[in-house]
Amino acid sequence: ELCDDDPPEIPHATFKAMAYKEGTMLNCECKRGFRRIKSGSLYMLCTGNSSHSSWDNQCQCTSSATRNTTKQVTPQPEEQKERKTTEMQSPMQPVDQASLPGHCREPPPWENEATERIYHFVVGQMVYYQCVQGYRALHRGPAESVCKMTHGKTRWTQPQLICTGEMETSQFPGEEKPQASPEGRPESETSCLVTTTDFQIQTEMAATMETSIFTTEYQ
């Protein structure tokens, strides 16, 4: 099933996925004046096994005399199997690069891609929130949101973060970028109440979630 909504917006905050669960799809979008190459992939797909995950397919854009008005389509499962596999890896990746089992990293940029990337996430995907420059974080709990399946419906958990209008006290590069934990915290599938614990992404292990897909977009 699709996650019906985008992750919640928090005033004066920005969110980002640090890794993408297997099954995540990314539309191959090109910026104005460019279009996907003929017979090019509609999307990239995060796929793999427990020890290694990578993006299948490669997005490619070519110059276009006319605007690309191709409607984006969410690929069907049978389409996914037929796609050619092309692993995309960024050159010169540091050896200390974090890797999460069952997750893909952000795909490297491709030439003349669209400004915005449109992802189709699976249930269990996490996004992480931080206050934008000039605002300070007041944590009441985890500054993250997880796409969950509850009572047969998908929803995003509410990040427990407030950003106040005081200048951030931490200085670059002292803060640490949150490391994505594989999946969401355990939460009862029979209870509609959301319970959260302290924000400790780096040290927590998490529970396995069902697989479904939703669409969101962020820059």
């Epitope: 992750p7 917006e9 920005t14 969110f15 980002k16 640090m18 910026k31 960024s90 050159p91 540091p94 200390d96 690069q97 974090a98 990293r105 952000e106 795909p107 490297p108 940029p109 491709w110 030439e111 003349n112 891609e113 669209a114 400004t115 915005e116 990337r117 931080q130 206050c131 934008v132 420059q133 931490s170 200085q171 670059f172 590069p173 002292g174 803060e175 640490e176 970028k177 962020y218 820059q219």
Partner: nanobody
């Protein structure tokens, strides 16, 4: 695949200046933070500076504030790092890197960490003699 190509490194005396340039032909600048890391011999790679390709906001490591200036030319798909008042401690291999912006086209300094960049250049060597 899209590549980042650095240039401008070299040997300079302490107190001198250098201008590094990163060419990113085909990169959609307004979807990324673009900037610089450096790695001195035997040390970890550290973030130096970046510019938000969407809104032009910049950030600098404390060690280079007031001495380094980052700028971009989105039309030419280049990002430059003007390095003034160079010190021996600034000697390192300088790498260009890009990282995807967050929602709303925003970017925060704590994301500018070596393991998490989306794409790297091969680096250019800066040597500062005392």
């Amino acid at each position: 695949q899209l590549q980042l190509v650095e240039s401008g490194g070299g040997l300079v005396q302490a107190g001198g200046s250098l201008r590094l340039s990163c060419a990113a032909s085909g990169l959609t600048f307004d979807g990324y933070a673009i900037g610089w890391f450096r790695q001195a011999s035997g040390k970890e790679r550290e973030g130096v500076s970046y510019i938000n390709g969407r809104d032009g906001s910049t950030f600098y490591a404390d060690s280079v504030k007031g001495r380094f200036i980052i700028s971009s030319d989105n039309a030419k798909n280049t990002v430059d790092l003007q390095m003034n008042s160079l010190k021996p401690d600034d000697a390192a291999v300088y790498y260009c890197a890009v990282d995807r912006l967050g929602s709303r086209g925003a970017y925060v300094s704590s994301w500018w960490r070596s393991p998490d960049m989306d794409l790297w250049g091969k680096g250019t060597l800066v040597t500062v003699s005392s």
